[in-house]
């Protein structure tokens, strides 16, 4: 028996279900009851969700797990992963075991998009050419961390004095916070790209300064 | 074809150091737990350490703890072993071990450490 | 000493059928999960068997079995090429670690 699975990581939204596929070539005249089939947590080596002995052991994972039992015979071994979590995330194997052995391992990516920015400033009144101002860029519930860009008016990237910190929630997601320190010019605008790096997906936040009242 | 390649024995002094380094290719290596296993001359096998497939999960045997350290990096698919505080009993050759369920289904060709003065 | 005992050698002459055992000291081995493994000489071990079953492209000659807590592993219509070290082993859920037997010699004779 030969057991294939995706080489590439199984990309899942927080909360949505996830399929990790898993599949063989059954020989003809093949039953389930001759089927031995586990799924663990690779690392770990705790078990996930089994099949032996011509029947569905069940769930030993939070019982968020199930397989397809009708298309089992036909050599479809996939599990299905509800209401995904952040802590869900890692390597899979799934064995099979009929008259011979094979296995084989899976990764899943979780992933959630972050918020759209806020944009705050530092002081935010009587703001004139040449003031240090602080402007923060904050997106909320994202996974996994982000990667963030500030950028001047004609799109020229601003690297210096930029701090950014991450922090995780109780439920593993992301709260970003970027803080660009800069010296006013006579007007500009200044933007916060949060880029997602699985679900490539870019956030953008800007804040224009003027001698009227500010724009976000 | 699965592989896996070591390198970096050689011949080191007791209380020195030494990194072995694994390259794998022909299966999807961020997915698989990996082990280090060793034979000693004329001896036979011992487990040295095993790692998780994102690196988060490490686990040593007694004779190694403190003194030896296993990582990966997925992105050059290669396995590391850094080995501090050398002594006599380390001499063996150095096997990178695939890991898949509970066996061990592809092993490396080795690499001999020698710990001598 | 290893929670693994195994015979430190064996022996037979071609076309006889050679057993080796693998037995659990400890009572929290998993006798289920035993794989066994030929180390040829001056070569890498080769996964042989796992779980008293063969992967695929090991000669049906090789076949495992388990009883209580010992592991067997059975080598009928003996051939020279099979002079090996044969070892067991078991991954550890209390420890995790892996445990291997100290290994046994098989000769033909």
């Known amino acids: 028996v030969e057991v294939q699975v995706s080489e590439d990581p199984v990309v899942a939204l927080v909360d949505t279900d996830a399929t990790l596929r898993c599949s063989f070539s059954p020989e003809p005249g093949f039953s389930l009851a001759q089927l031995n089939l586990i799924w663990q947590l690779t690392d770990t080596k705790q078990l996930v969700h089994s099949f032996t002995e011509g029947r569905d052991q069940g769930s030993a994972y939070s019982n968020r797990t199930a397989l397809f039992p009708d298309l089992l015979v036909q050599g479809n071994a996939s599990l299905r992963l509800q209401r995904v979590r952040v802590t869900d995330e890692g390597s899979y194997t799934c064995f099979v075991s009929i008259q011979d052995f094979d296995s084989a391992a899976v990764s899943l990516q979780v992933a959630a998009p972050y918020s759209k920015p806020s944009m705050t400033l530092e002081p935010n009144k009587d703001l004139r050419p040449g003031n240090m101002v602080t402007i923060t860029c904050s997106s909320y519930q994202g996974y996994p961390e982000a990667e963030v860009f500030w950028k001047d008016g004609q799109g020229v990237p601003l690297t210096g004095n930029v701090t950014t910190s991450q922090m995780a929630n109780e439920r593993g997601l992301f709260d970003v916070h970027s803080v660009l320190r800069v010296v006013l010019g006579a007007n500009g605008t200044y933007s916060c790209l949060v880029r997602n790096p699985v679900l490539q997906q870019d956030a953008h936040g800007s804040v224009t300064i003027t001698g009227q009242p500010l724009t976000f | 074809e699965v592989q896996l390649l070591e390198s970096g024995g050689g011949l080191v002094q007791p209380g020195g150091s030494l990194r072995l380094s694994c390259a794998a290719s022909?299966?999807?290596?961020?997915?698989?737990?990996m082990s280090w296993v060793r034979q000693a001359p004329g001896k036979g096998l011992e487990w040295v350490a095993y790692?998780?497939?994102?690196?988060?999960?490490?686990y040593y045997a007694d004779s190694v703890k403190g003194r030896f350290t296993i990582s990966r990096d997925n992105s050059k698919n290669t396995l590391y072993l850094q080995m501090n505080s050398l002594r006599a009993e380390d001499t063996a050759v150095y096997y990178c071990?695939?890991?898949?369920?509970?066996?061990?289904?592809?092993w490396g060709q080795g690499t001999t450490v020698t710990v001598s003065s | 000493q290893s929670v693994l005992t195994q015979p430190p050698s064996a022996s037979g002459t071609p076309g006889q059928r050679v057993t080796i055992s693998c037995s659990a000291t400890?009572?929290?081995?998993?006798?289920?999960?035993v794989s066994w493994y030929q180390q040829l000489p001056g070569t890498a071990p080769k996964l042989l068997i796992f779980?008293?079953q063969r992967p695929s492209g090991v000669p049906d000659r090789f076949s495992g079995s388990k009883s209580g807590t010992s592991a067997s592993l059975a080598i009928s219509g003996l051939q020279s090429e099979d002079e090996a070290d044969y070892y067991c082993?078991?991954?550890?859920?209390?420890?995790?670690?892996?445990?291997f037997g100290g290994g046994t010699k098989l000769t033909v004779l």
């Open positions: 071990v695939k890991e898949s369920y509970y066996y061990m289904d592809v």
């Open positions: 400890i009572s929290n081995i998993d006798i289920n999960r």
């Open positions: 082993a078991t991954w550890d859920d209390s420890l995790n670690s892996w445990v």
């Open positions: 022909g299966f999807t290596f961020r997915s698989y737990a």
């Open positions: 779980n008293s």
């Open positions: 790692i998780g497939s994102s690196g988060g999960t490490t």
